[in-house]
Interface confidence: low
């Protein structure tokens, strides 16, 4: 085979709900013809399955072949460099890819105002790749929690936090007016999954939203 190719230095998964992406770092001094072979092993079926013979990118979307992740014991992946007839040794992910490795996200956050309260509704993710019965709430059926961060604009550093246990929440604005910006980070109390903060959603509160009660 001539000179041996170096192996990819590292291989890892970055995953959100039904969005499972394998990443790797390139070999040093790769040529224009260098590509990467990807293989996948499902725990319980102890054989490697070739997924891609020649990927020229540094990532590969494995969602379609790991759709049963949330009902399985997990996966490992491996990648090797290929250049013509030469190939490197395999580099294997150093941890099992399981439901625990999935970063939790929300789909979106909707805000409205009612009598001085900001009412929020968290929309759960609905990825197109997910099988019909595999909803976020069926897979994470208990102990869903959300950290809510509220920022009043202007004032980048004056904000509050609260944790809620439902997809609907309310925030009392203490009679203040102005623009309020809200972000949400999901978690599941019984699990160790990391959560990703949602994009900021803002809503303007003016005096017209307050009703006077005697």
């Amino acid at each position: 085979h001539g000179t041996e190719l170096p192996s990819p230095p590292s291989v890892w998964f970055e995953a959100e709900f039904f969005h499972h992406i394998l990443h790797w770092t390139p070999i040093p001094n790769q040529s224009e013809s260098t590509c990467y072979e990807v293989a996948l092993l499902r725990y319980g079926i102890e054989s490697w399955n070739s997924i891609s013979n020649c990927s020229q990118t540094l990532s590969y979307d494995l969602t379609a072949v790991t759709l049963d992740l949330y009902h399985s014991n997990g996966y490992r992946a491996r990648v090797r460099a290929v250049d013509g007839s030469r190939h490197s040794n395999w580099t294997v992910t150093n941890t099992r890819f399981s439901v625990d490795e999935v970063t939790l996200t929300v789909g979106s956050v909707n805000l409205e105002i009612h009598n001085g309260f900001i009412l929020g509704k968290i929309q759960l993710p609905r990825p197109k790749m997910a099988p019909a019965n595999d909803t976020y709430e069926s897979i994470f059926s208990h102990f869903r929690e959300y950290e809510i961060a509220i920022r009043k604009v202007p004032g980048n550093f004056t904000f509050t936090h609260k944790k809620v246990k439902h997809e609907n929440f309310s925030l009392l604005t203490s009679g203040e007016v102005g623009e309020f910006c809200v972000q949400v980070k999901p978690s599941v109390a019984s699990r160790s999954n990391k959560g990703m903060w949602s994009k900021e959603e803002c809503i303007s509160l003016t005096r017209q939203y307050f009703t006077v009660t005697n």
Epitope: A149, R151, N156, F159, H161, Q183, G195, M196, W197
Partner: nanobody, 126 residues
Amino acid sequence: QVQLQESGGGSVQAGGSLRLSCGASGYTYSGYCMGWFRQAPGKEREGVAVIDSDGSTSYADSVKGRFTISKDNGKNTLYLQMNSLKPEDTAMYYCAADLGHYRPPCGVLYLGMDYWGKGTQVTVSS
């Protein structure tokens, strides 16, 4: 996997100084919120000082003017210089980091950190 390891705690007389360090490893993100939090026995965990990836800092009112947070990006180490220590500063001090995208502004009320160290004890006697 991200790991945070605190050091530098100990016992000191009121008015003395300590410097806490937190070594961070296992991440390559340029955007982060890192900080020091503390928990005294029987009390809730509270924010002490935080630093954002742009270098902006924020302090709890109780430590302003006495504590200074800083980060050495080359060494991937977070520091907390604590001067004029008081007995009420006695607590377990934790280093924490949030490396997520879209995070809210980094502030001392921010308890939504993804990664926490195991803590280092600071005891200030009168």
